[in-house]
């Protein structure tokens, strides 16, 4: 025999059940929106201090490079790979061709202002790149010098100089006070090393390692 | 679109999907009890109303032969 | 954790949530369903069982005096 | 010891022109990058131009540009300097100068006396 | 081009005192540890001769009471204790780039 609830009873279980199902709803919303919070604000913060960090490096470029040009490397939004507008890309560096007749000294100067170096050509397929970008009637400074006149010769960002990686001109280097190299073109040999005189005024090739944001 | 504004579209539908479903399925149970009282009250206690098996999230309808 | 990996967990949880709620809500309309048909049985025809009212996306228990 | 001996300067009419030669001893001069520079009575020095050793560059200032030519005979240890054109702002005391190199830029080690060319009509 | 600016134009000292020449550049004439400025000394109807190479560097021959100093754009040539000898015109020189260029020059005179 099942005892008979009283109408009050039951009104009052009711109740009871409403507010037990109504707060789970709350909770399981609650923790919906705590999981949804967290993953809109959190990537949001993390995004914005991504992008402070960003912009705080842009700034540090902005003085010599008012504008960049960016590509996405792989998948992922986050990394971006840049050069100096003007400047080429080639694997993990930028180039830049300064037309202006300077000495090898003022050349190298001018490429540290942007924030890089005259060119190390460390590959084949590196010159192969460069020598498209460069006019046949003109020679173009390297950051390779022998100041010693000693021929040690030896690249301005310190790595070291590699005898089987080089391409000098048949004959070159040929005179102990030509200190400083150019990249030129011979018509017999293409394009090739040479050494001269470090002030005489030539064009320059300046290379950057990419900026990544 | 890029693949994290996909994730972050997805992630909104789900929500609130997610919400919805929450209400309907709450709707749905106070309902299923209600409905189990008035069916008790109307018959004149030929039914003994919802019984909660073993806490389940669910309940299902009870039927039972009213005490004679 | 990365930014789009957060995104993707919370994927995962709220696809997860989603399921499980849809399930439950789905099992629990089968049971009124199938109580209702029970119901209408045993009792001889007392109770019609449910009726879809609007086509709603939840149902109630309609009782009601079967015709005489 | 090194010794570097100037000749050639003299008295000329504008447009007119000189050669100065420089005769060198003492050394390899074939080894040598070699320089004029010039001295206008009163006033301080004025390079002219330079040869490099192996006479594969020249250099001049844009003062004479296309009027002078630096040139050397490494068999006879000279060097020359070939004026045309000359104008009275090119009056001075002419030098020959070796060369020597230092890290990325060079000195004048030695220097001739000097050889007088007055530009006047 | 690079011009190179000398002060005093005139110095007026005596025997046995010490002298202090500069030399200006306009713009930097060093390269990292290289600082390429020259100084040399000319005295009436004579050729110039080299004192000081590379700003420190004493050419050999020349009396250790010479000395040079500096780096970027200014330079210094010092004689501890002027000798009667040492009284003449001294130059100061550039060659980091072309052209090469000369101050006007200090003329150190007996007072």
């Known amino acids: 025999m099942v005892p008979e609830e009283e109408p009050q009873d039951r009104e009052k279980g009711l109740w009871w059940f409403q507010l037990k199902v109504w707060s789970m709803a709350v909770v399981s919303i609650l923790l919906l929106s705590v999981c949804f919070t967290v993953s809109s604000v959190v990537p949001h913060n993390f995004m914005y201090s991504k992008t402070v960090k960003r912009l705080s490096k842009l700034r540090e470029y902005q003085q010599y490079h008012p504008s960049l040009t960016c590509v996405m490397e792989g998948k992922d939004i986050e990394d971006w790979s840049c050069c100096p507008t003007p400047w080429t890309s080639f694997q993990s560096s930028c180039y830049f061709i300064s037309t202006g007749m300077q000495s090898w000294t003022k050349s190298q100067k001018n490429c540290s202002v942007m924030g890089a170096d005259l060119v190390v050509i460390n590959t084949r397929e590196e010159q192969d790149f460069i020598i498209q970008n460069l006019k046949r009637n003109s020679s173009y400074f390297l950051g390779l010098s022998d100041p010693g006149g000693r021929r040690h010769w030896q690249w301005v960002d310190q790595t070291p100089y590699n005898e089987n990686v080089t391409f000098w001109h048949s004959g070159e280097p040929n005179n102990l006070d030509e200190r400083c190299a150019i990249i030129n073109f011979r018509s017999s040999e293409e394009w090739g090393w040479n050494d001269i005189h470090c002030h005489v005024p030539q064009k320059s090739i300046c290379k950057m390692k990419k900026i990544y944001i | 679109l890029g693949e994290p504004q996909l994730c972050y579209i997805l992630d909104a539908i789900l929500f609130l999907y997610g919400i919805v479903l929450t209400l309907l399925y709450c709707r749905l149970k106070i309902q299923v009890r209600k409905a189990a009282i008035t069916s008790y009250e109307k018959s004149d206690g030929v039914y003994t109303g919802l019984s909660t098996r073993n806490q389940e999230t669910y309940e299902t309808l009870k039927h039972e032969k009213p005490p004679q | 954790l990365g930014e789009p990996q957060l995104c993707y967990i919370l994927d995962a949880i709220l696809f997860l949530y989603g399921i499980v709620l849809t399930l439950l809500y789905c099992r629990l309309k089968i049971q009124v369903r199938k109580a209702a048909i029970t119901s209408y049985e045993k009792s001889d025809g007392v109770y019609t069982g449910l009726s879809t009212r609007n086509q709603e996306t939840y149902e109630t228990l309609k009782h009601e005096k079967p015709p005489q | 010891e090194v010794q570097l001996v100037e000749s050639g300067g003299g008295l000329v009419k504008p447009g007119g022109s000189l050669r100065l030669s420089c005769a060198a001893s003492?050394?390899?001069?074939?080894?040598?990058?070699m320089s004029w520079v010039r001295q206008a009575p009163g006033k301080g020095l004025e390079w002219v131009s330079t040869i490099s050793s192996g006479d594969s560059y020249t250099y001049y200032p844009d003062s004479v540009k296309g009027r002078f030519t630096i040139s050397r005979d490494n068999a006879k240890n000279s060097l020359y300097l070939q004026m045309n054109s000359l104008r009275a702002e090119d009056t001075a005391v002419y030098y020959c100068a070796r060369q020597i190199y230092y890290d990325y830029a060079y000195y004048f080690d030695f220097w001739g006396q000097g050889t007088t060319v007055t530009v006047s009509s | 081009e690079i011009v190179l600016t000398q002060s005093p134009a005139t110095l007026s000292l005596s025997p046995g005192e010490r002298a202090t020449l500069s030399c200006r550049a306009s713009?930097?004439?060093?390269?990292?540890?290289?600082?390429?400025m020259h100084w040399y000394q000319q005295k009436p109807g004579q050729a110039p001769r080299l004192l000081i190479y590379g700003a420190s560097n004493l050419e050999s021959g020349i009396p250790a009471r010479f000395s040079g100093s500096g780096s970027e754009t200014d330079f210094t040539l010092t004689i501890s204790r002027l000798e009667p000898e040492d009284f003449a015109v001294y130059f100061c020189?550039?060659?980091?780039?072309?052209?090469?260029?000369f101050g006007g020059g200090t003329k150190v005179e007996i007072k």
């Open positions: 020189q550039q060659s980091i780039e072309d052209p090469p260029t």
């Open positions: 003492g050394f390899t001069f074939s080894s040598y990058g």
């Open positions: 713009e930097s004439v060093s390269f990292r540890t290289s600082h390429l």
